[in-house]
Amino acid sequence: MMTGTIETTGNISAEKGGSIILQCHLSSTTAQVTQVNWEQQDQLLAICNADLGWHISPSFKDRVAPGPGLGLTLQSLTVNDTGEYFCIYHTYPDGTYTGRIFLEVLESSVAEHGARFQIP
């Protein structure tokens, strides 16, 4: 039975040209995290493998930095970066947990962080 929950940074906004940290945290489970995949729709951004380290997709290599922790830093944001991002935790023995973050990239300088929320 999967007992874990994923806490994410929820709905967030950031300024065009700036950077943002995407963070997820898996709690309430003793399952071992073997890998975390970061995706935007069907595009892979990065994978953090517990044994092998980070793999950043070549499409994002110049704009994505690993960390902090299992999170991901998106740099040089454009309005095209607006959309849903997913952290997919591969765990043993539980299986897969998915968290969702919605990022809005704003033209103006008024960019505030949204509230945290949890996905069971």
């Epitope: 995949n37 069907d42 892979l44 044994d51 793999h55 950043i56 997709s57 897969t96």
Partner: antibody, heavy 120, light 107 residues
Framework: EVQLQESGPGLAKPSQTPSLTCSVT????????WNWIRKFPGNKLEYMGY???????YYNPSLKSRISITRDTSKNQFYLQLNSVTTEDTATYYC??????????????WGQGTSVTVSS | DIVMTQSHKFMSTSVGDRVSITCRAS??????IAWYQQKPGQSPKLLIY???YRYTGVPDRFTGSGSGTDFTFTISGVQAEDLAVYYC?????????FGGGTKLEIK
């Protein structure tokens, strides 16, 4: 130029535990990760597992109770041991190198393969 | 495990033709796909990684595309030396898994 060369017993009897060796030249095994893959008669490829630059191992769960991957960095070799073989383990065994940071799970340097036939 | 399905075990083509090999994943694998070529008597060679990126030294007649569950590997202007078995592989999650292979035959 990196070269990988597999060697093994060629023939094994059912229930035996053959050991295969992959000798790496032109590159230090203390970087990247090092894989075993086998190809069955009829072209099916099966990923068996890896040993990482740090010595951490991953085994395909379908083989987990029977497989062991070890290394000797002083000899620049890594090894595959498969316990309790049956005729179903008859295959060509390949070792291959991966660079997770740049290529993820895509493996780009392969040995020529060594054939193992299990027969009584 | 993620199952990779290459629906054609064999494909026949002529020199100069364009040929496309398809691969379907049993669940979404984003763009974590590699394509390999295995010529008779040789070991597999990496051609494409991250679904669409050519590995170093791979001729530009080889291209890959797709994301999610459906992927295509295309050879534009097939040459006689392209006779081989072509495999897709996913590395979205462990264990990495391969398609069953598509054998390209040259008429």
């Amino acid at each position: 130029e990196v070269q990988l060369q597999e060697s093994g017993p060629g023939l094994a009897k059912p229930s035996q535990t053959p050991s295969l060796t992959c000798s790496v030249t032109g590159y230090s095994m203390t970087s990247d990760y090092w894989n075993w893959i086998r190809k069955f008669p009829g072209n099916k490829l099966e990923y068996m597992g890896y040993i990482s630059y740090s010595g951490r191992t991953y085994y395909n769960p379908s083989l987990k109770s029977r497989i062991s991957i070890t290394r000797d960095t002083s000899k620049n070799q890594f090894y595959l041991q498969l316990n309790s073989v049956t005729t179903e383990d008859t295959a060509t065994y390949y070792c291959a190198r991966g660079d997770y940071s740049n290529y993820g799970g895509a493996m780009y340097d392969w040995g020529q393969g060594t054939s193992v036939t299990v027969s009584s | 495990d993620i199952v990779m399905t290459q629906s054609h075990k064999f494909m026949s083509t002529s020199v100069g033709d364009r040929v496309s090999i398809t691969c379907r994943a049993s669940q979404g694998v984003s763009t974590t796909i590699a394509w390999y070529q295995q010529k008779p008597g040789q070991s597999p060679k990496l051609l494409i990684y991250s679904a669409s990126y050519r590995y170093t030294g791979v001729p530009d007649r080889f291209t890959g595309s797709g994301s999610g569950t459906d992927f295509t590997f295309t050879i534009s202007g097939v040459q006689a030396e392209d006779l081989a078995v072509y495999y897709c592989q996913q590395y979205y999650s462990s264990p990495f898994t391969f398609g069953g292979g598509t054998k390209l035959e040259i008429k």
